[in-house]
């Protein structure tokens, strides 16, 4: 049962990290114009990593797309990219994982398969995650820099009492899903890796036991511990010998503990 | 036709307060910033403040701030503009003007304005 | 506060002549994020309320006559009436739309020489 639960909240987790990511990738605040030094302006900037957008006063919102590719800064395309590997990768191992759920039977399918692809999509979730908080970090970074760059030479001088002020940007809405995304993910992909530790077969090898019974003989040879979807009983992985029975739930199965930041 | 129709001019004394009105209609009161502007005779214009009567959210000018309020009755698509404490350097025309939605914060219809005078 | 400071203080063009008003901001109105200034230009008759000509420092308003044109960047801005026509005769003000509180020039008034 803790196996059960640890998989199928794992999946629940990572499919939650992975629209957080796919929401943080699309979203326009990656950027957002620092008002702490001109809070009276009427016109607002945020920038994301497909577009830049302006709000005015008048709650009109006007965005233009970066349509160039050659033109845009190194950091911002890697930042895209690490982003869109770990939606694929996210999408890949949701995709793994829902054949892998203990819950859902599809066919003959061996028990030690179901463990193989739960791990394999844990390994994935927990890339994906890894390139999202990655992504998110890097982009993070940039801008600080960029902030403490703008700060250093904040207004230029034009000539009298002339000014230009630089416009700053700082923290958006779309990090925060991003970071908080991509934990999630992170945190799913480990609970399915924990998840195929118990979901693997135990190679418990019994000594056949002779029954010598009158007229004829007949020996009970006991097949490995193999686990069910959960449906019914599986004929084929019946267990004849039982040696102290235990629960396909109880192999393994560790208690987890998580600290959410 | 979008139409801004001011209330009627006003004569006050030193230290009284006045409340003028501005009638909107033509268009979705609520969906359009409304400001005031005021202007003294014979001088230039001074903006007071504006309020978005979607969701009664208000800024207004330093200079004016605590004896300026700003409100609006949605069912009437009225906004109004109080000014308190009033002395004679009040004395000025003073519009509502609609804030253009596309047009770079640039307000695109006034109303016909109202007088007011402080006098002793 | 942005000041915006306007000249000519007063101006007499002959009717068909090209007449110019300057506007001069404080601060930058150019907006980085979209490019564009936020700078309207305004005209007043006695006795009437402010309307709108130009916006976004070059945008003409809908039902300007076209001899109206609006120039400019980042704190240096024109007005330029291509050919004076007698209803042309008012004050016109420059505002500036990037920053609160609004802030207006003192005004320029054309008259006819």
């Known amino acids: 049962m803790a196996v059960t639960a640890c998989q199928g909240l794992g999946f629940v987790v990572s499919l939650i990290g992975i629209a957080g990511i796919i929401a943080a990738t699309c979203m326009d605040q990656w950027s957002t114009q620092d008002l702490y030094n001109n809070p009276v302006t009427a016109v607002f900037n945020y920038q994301g990593l497909w577009r830049s957008c302006v709000r005015e006063s008048s709650g009109f919102t006007e965005c233009r797309g970066y349509f160039t590719l050659l033109g845009l800064p190194a950091m911002l395309q890697a930042v895209r990219a690490l982003m869109i590997v770990g939606i694929v990768l996210g999408a890949i191992g949701l995709l793994v994982s829902i054949f892998a759920l203990k819950c859902i039977r599809i066919g003959s399918m061996e028990d030690s398969a179901k463990a193989n692809m739960t791990l394999t999509s844990g390994i994935m979730f927990i890339v994906s995650g890894l390139c999202a908080i990655a992504g998110v970090s890097v982009f993070a970074n940039m801008l600080v820099t960029n902030f403490w760059m703008s700060t250093a030479n904040m207004y230029t001088g034009m000539g009298g009492m002339v000014q230009t002020v630089q416009t700053r940007y700082t923290f958006g809405a779309a990090l925060f899903v991003g970071w908080v995304a991509g934990g999630l993910t992170l945190i799913g992909g480990v609970m399915m890796c924990i998840a195929c530790r118990g979901l693997a077969p135990e190679e418990t090898n019994y000594k056949a036991v002779s029954y010598h019974a009158s007229g004829h003989s007949v020996a009970y040879k006991p097949g490995g511990f193999k686990a069910s979807t959960g449906f019914g009983s599986n004929t084929k992985n019946k267990k004849i010998y039982d040696g102290g029975a235990r629960t396909e739930d109880e192999v393994q199965s560790y208690p987890s503990k998580h600290d959410y930041v | 036709e979008v139409q801004l129709v001011q209330s009627g001019a006003e004569v006050k004394k030193p230290g009284a307060s006045v409340k003028v009105s501005c009638k909107a209609s033509?268009?979705?009161?609520?969906?359009?910033?409304m400001h005031w502007v005021r202007q003294a005779p014979g001088q230039g214009l001074e903006w007071i403040g504006y309020i978005n009567p979607y969701n009664d959210g208000t800024k207004y000018n330093e200079k004016f701030k605590g004896r300026v309020t700003l409100t609006r009755d949605k069912s009437t698509s009225t906004v109004y503009m109080e000014l308190s404490s009033l002395r004679s350097e009040d004395t000025a025309v003073y519009y509502c003007?609609?804030?253009?939605?596309?047009?770079?914060?640039?307000?695109?219809?006034w109303g016909q304005g109202t007088l007011v005078t402080v006098s002793s | 506060d942005i000041v915006m400071t306007q000249s000519p203080d007063s101006l007499a063009v002959s009717l068909g002549e090209r007449a110019t008003i300057n506007c001069k901001s404080s601060q930058s109105l150019l907006n980085s994020g979209n490019q564009k200034n936020y700078l309207a230009w305004y005209q007043q008759k006695p006795g009437q309320p402010p309307k709108l000509l130009i916006y976004g420092a070059s945008t003409r308003e809908s039902g300007v006559p076209d001899r109206f044109t609006g120039s400019g960047s980042g704190t240096d801005f024109t007005l330029t009436i291509s050919s004076l026509q007698a209803e042309d005769v008012a004050v016109y003000y420059c505002?500036?739309?990037?920053?609160?509180?609004?802030?207006f020039g003192q005004g320029t008034k054309l008259e006819i020489k």
């Open positions: 505002q500036n739309d990037h920053s609160y509180p609004f802030t």
């Open positions: 033509g268009y979705t009161f609520t969906s359009y910033i």
């Open positions: 003007a609609r804030l253009g939605f596309t047009t770079r914060n640039a307000m695109d219809y």
